[in-house]
Amino acid sequence: FERTRSLQDPCSNCPAGTFCDNNRNQICSPCPPNSFSSAGGQRTCDICRQCKGVFRTRKECSSTSNAECDCTPGFHCLGAGCSMCEQDCKQGQELTKKGCKDCCFGTFNDQKRGICRPWTNCSLDGKSVLVNGTKERDVVCGPSPADLSPGASSVTPPAPAREPGHSPQ
């Protein structure tokens, strides 16, 4: 089948890194600079992705593979293949359209990205607050008074905070 196909379509013999040049009797020509073909039999080469501005180059483009970008420090990747860069914030903040804003009282964010989440409500589990929450850290729940009797187990980990729904802006 391959032999038959190559007789019918000379372009099928062109390997990755080349294209089938219709202007030159369908001979295989190398991809021009800043372009690539990742599969054989291509009639054109694709333009290399440019990593500039908010993006920086993680892997250079070659004749057979596209460039790969990540984000310039101060920003982080979003989307498949780092299709977007989003601004970092400090711990204790979240990103809004107005830039980085401090978490409201009663919420925290322990990362440079993502949203502020409510502190764990220890009382929902019948526990008390052992360590108060901050903008950067969740509360630490401690044992309830009933658990403090002799032989009671030590501090249990906090219940996971529920992700709040985003409010539209």
């Epitope: 908010v54 920003f75 979003l78 977007m84 860069c85 989003e86 359209k97 985003h166 409010s167 802006q169």
Partner: nanobody, 123 residues
Framework: QVQLVESGGGLVQPGGSLRLSCAAT?????NYWMNWVRQAPGKGLEW???????????YYVDSVKGRFTISRDNAKNSLFLQMNSLRAEDTAVYYC????????????????SGQGTTVTVSS
């Protein structure tokens, strides 16, 4: 091809002014939020300002509030940054960057940016 090209940078004395421009090609500017970001020598990238599709919402990093003004001319597919009362700490490469089609709750990512224009504030 989607492209952003910045211009207008240069050497200016402290207290001086510059107006940066960003020309967009390959897409309709009026569909997108737009941003200016900057990178000072040896520092990370910093968001400076953004503007919504029709120019009715504009936001700035605290350090430039009252000194910088972001604006846009959708008819000319252009974005601008008027920089007044410039300080040495404003020295950086300035980039315009395309944001989302609607800043909702999902992300504030930027997917296209230019090569940048250099602003040097020095006496």
């Amino acid at each position: 091809q989607v492209q952003l090209v910045e211009s207008g940078g240069g050497l200016v004395q402290p207290g001086g002014s510059l107006r940066l421009s960003c020309a967009a090609t390959g897409f309709t500017l009026s569909n997108y939020w737009m941003n200016w970001v900057r990178q000072a020598p040896g520092k990370g990238l910093e968001w400076v300002a953004n503007i919504n599709q029709d120019g009715s919402e504009k936001y700035y990093v605290d350090s430039v509030k009252g000194r910088f003004t972001i604006s846009r001319d959708n008819a000319k597919n252009s974005l601008f940054l008027q920089m007044n009362s410039l300080r040495a700490e404003d020295t950086a490469v300035y980039y315009c960057a395309r944001g989302g089609t609607g800043y909702g709750s999902d992300h504030y990512g930027m997917d296209v940016s230019g090569q940048g224009t250099t602003v040097t504030v020095s006496s």
